[in-house]
Interface confidence: medium
């Protein structure tokens, strides 16, 4: 399976909520021997990968944020610990995934990366990745409503498996 | 913030079998890889095995296969290593110590080691 | 099985040195190289991930470079509480295996 990022650039003015996507492509197994591991953090661009290193959001760490459920469920972070930080990861029975940040503010700006675990039972794993960027902007440049950027089809289908 | 506390030393007999235990608290315990590390004195970190307990199932290293059993308790949020045959050079202090993600990743958080020392 | 091997095994340094510890993997394991400090008594405390990401807490004098099969372990300016062992750790594949330790003395 690969991970799609519909979008690769959000802009946001202060004070606004954004829900940055991410989806999963091709097939995917839903037996009783595999758990899907979906998380998000923040990253740098790094010099050899994208998304290698795995920053907090909002102080919530990649842990903190994850969802972890057979190939069959929904599922949703803990509740009380996300919201208390204006955060909400899910992820639901169509291969969507997305975290949903609340009141955004200029620091909030930056890499946003989306990782999927396939973990299997005998020992195996594939992960794959997607990235985005949000902007924050404040004054009069700063768009009324979040705006939004298609992602290219190459940057749209960001795959890196272990 | 995860932590994972280890059972206390153990002094045993070559032949017979020893059973460390390490239970974590402060985060999700079932979805997380739990491996088992252990250091002979004055040596070097050596895997001995390890765990996801929502599956069940161990991986070893060659090495201890068949005198390692490595197990976890979901409901108490504990992982068990039982090592059999015991003999003098398996001497060492044995470390819990869990993935970041998946079966490979890096152990960010471990537990504080307990000696067993197998002396006649 | 994929072997690390670590070097020197043993050096010794001054407060204030830029020390540098490597570790070759006897294949490519892209960036699937960790670091480890280790001090007498204590378990191990991870200072790098994915060979070149600082964990979150650890001072930003430890660095880390590296991909394929030749990876480094920097500290730029050596402090008094880094006198210990060292350890790389390739998490490519199973069975996980470490280099064979670093030990940073004091000069």
């Known amino acids: 399976f690969k991970v799609a990022t519909p979008y690769s650039l959000y802009v946001c003015p202060e004070g606004q909520n954004v829900t940055l996507t991410c989806r999963l492509l091709g097939p995917v197994d839903k037996g009783h021997d595999v758990t899907f591991y979906k998380t998000w953090y923040r990253s740098s661009r790094g010099e050899v990968q994208t998304c290698s290193e795995r920053r907090p959001i909002r102080n919530l760490t990649f842990q903190d944020l994850h969802l972890h459920h057979g190939g069959h469920q929904a599922a949703n972070t803990s509740h009380d610990l996300a919201q208390r930080h204006g955060l909400e990861s899910a992820s639901d029975h169509h291969g969507n995934f997305s975290i949903t940040m609340r009141n955004l503010t200029l620091l909030d700006s930056g890499l946003y990366c989306c990782l999927v675990v396939e973990i299997r039972h005998h020992h195996s794993e594939h992960r794959v990745h997607g990235a985005m960027e949000l902007q924050v902007q404040t004054g009069k440049d700063a768009p009324s409503n979040c705006v939004v950027y298609p992602s290219s089809s190459q940057d749209s289908e960001n795959i890196t498996a272990a | 913030q995860v932590q994972l506390v280890q059972s206390g030393a153990e002094v045993k007999k070559p032949g017979s079998s020893v059973k460390v235990s390490c239970k974590a608290s402060?985060?999700?315990?079932?979805?997380?890889?739990i491996s088992w590390v252990r250091q002979a004195p004055g040596q070097g970190l050596e895997w001995m095995g390890g765990?996801?307990?929502?599956?069940?199932?161990?991986n070893y290293a060659q090495k201890f296969q068949g005198r390692v059993t490595i197990t976890a308790d979901e409901s108490t949020s504990t992982a068990y290593m039982e090592l059999s045959s015991l003999r003098s050079e398996d001497t060492a202090v044995y470390y819990c110590?869990?993935?970041?993600?998946?079966?490979?990743?890096?152990?960010?958080?471990w537990g504080q080691g307990t000696l067993v020392t197998v002396s006649s | 099985d994929i072997q690390m091997t670590q070097s020197p095994s043993s050096l010794s340094a001054s407060v204030g040195d830029r020390v540098t510890i490597t570790c070759r993997a006897s294949?490519?394991?892209?960036?699937?190289l960790n670091w480890y400090q280790q001090k007498p008594g204590k378990a191990p405390k991870l200072l790098i991930y994915?060979?070149?990401s600082l964990q979150s807490g650890v001072p930003s004098r430890f660095s880390g470079s590296g991909s394929g099969t030749d990876f480094t372990l920097t500290i730029s300016s050596l402090q008094p509480e880094d006198f210990a062992t060292y350890y790389c750790?390739?998490?490519?594949?199973?069975?996980?295996?470490f280099g064979q330790g670093t030990k940073v003395e004091i000069k």
């Open positions: 750790q390739q998490a490519h594949w199973y069975p996980l295996t």
């Open positions: 110590a869990r993935h970041s993600i998946g079966w490979v990743a890096e152990l960010d958080y």
């Open positions: 765990i996801i307990p929502i599956f069940g199932t161990a």
């Open positions: 994915a060979a070149s």
């Open positions: 294949q490519s394991i892209a960036t699937d």
């Open positions: 402060g985060g999700t315990f079932s979805s997380y890889a």
